[in-house]
């Protein structure tokens, strides 16, 4: 297994909508065509996979239907979106990547970013 | 904790044909990539060929045109059909799942399976 460097932003804050976008990019030593991105969340010293995607460069990347997570990959960079997240959902979110083709493989791990999540204030009951 | 288990070697001779089996516990195929290497005495553990979870094979320029990589999923198996076979393809030959499992890299292997190619 061959270490890589992947780069992502220290800290995102989610929207009001409980969605967070970051950018991983990674650096390829070589010409991949295909890679393996899996988030991970590290909270309390606990990791869990939030998703994962493999793609053929050039195309789209494809998550499981139920995901939280939305994707686009541009040259050795990928855009991701994870939705649906609460207050409790806070914590540090890694970013993993997989060269797993050509040979040799590689795997790269993030630094991971820190996404803070706020749950909106309820609205106030209306008089009218 | 992943187990491979080969089988299929034998002796064969030359020009002949052999089909080894990978067998490994739950599907891996997923997420790893399952490859065959061979060791021949006194050398190094080299790279025979490879299939990814997107389908992606690799062989090595000696045995490309002959030998053929496929997995069966519902049978959790990944195969080498090794045709034409040389004397100089004689090796333990391993099964190999290489991926990785939260943050850490994993690196499976089998307990090997000889093939020995000879007149």
């Known amino acids: 297994c061959k270490a890589m460097h992947v780069a992502q932003p220290a800290v995102v804050l989610a929207s009001s909508r409980g969605i967070a976008s970051f950018v991983c990019e990674y650096a390829s030593p070589g010409k991949a065509t295909e890679v393996r991105v899996t988030v991970l969340r590290q909270a309390d010293s606990q990791v869990t996979e939030v998703c994962a995607a493999t793609y053929m460069m050039g195309n789209e990347l494809t998550f499981l239907d139920d995901s939280i997570c939305t994707g686009t990959s541009s040259g050795n960079q990928v855009n991701l979106t994870i939705q649906g997240l609460r207050a409790m959902d806070t914590g540090l979110y890694i970013c993993k990547v997989e060269l797993m083709y050509p040979p040799p493989y590689y795997l790269g791990i993030g630094n991971g970013t820190q996404i803070y999540v706020i749950d909106p204030e309820p609205c106030p009951d209306s008089d009218f | 904790e992943v187990q491979l288990v080969e089988s299929g070697g034998g002796l064969v001779q030359p020009g002949g044909s052999l089909r080894l089996s990978c067998a490994a516990s739950?599907?891996?195929?997923?997420?790893?990539?399952m490859g065959w290497y061979r060791q021949a005495p006194g050398n190094q553990r080299d790279l025979v060929a490879s299939?990814?979870?997107?389908?992606?094979?690799y062989y090595a320029d000696s045995v490309k045109g002959r030998f053929t990589i496929s997995r069966d999923g519902a049978k959790n198996t990944v195969y080498l059909q090794m045709n034409s076979l040389k004397p100089e393809d004689t090796a333990v030959y391993y099964c190999?799942?290489?991926?990785?499992?939260?943050?850490?890299?994993?690196?499976?292997w089998g307990q090997g399976t000889q093939v020995t190619v000879s007149s």
């Open positions: 739950g599907n891996i195929f997923t997420r790893n990539i």
């Open positions: 299939i990814t979870p997107g389908g992606n094979m």
């Open positions: 190999n799942a290489r991926g990785s499992i939260l943050l850490d890299p994993s690196n499976y």
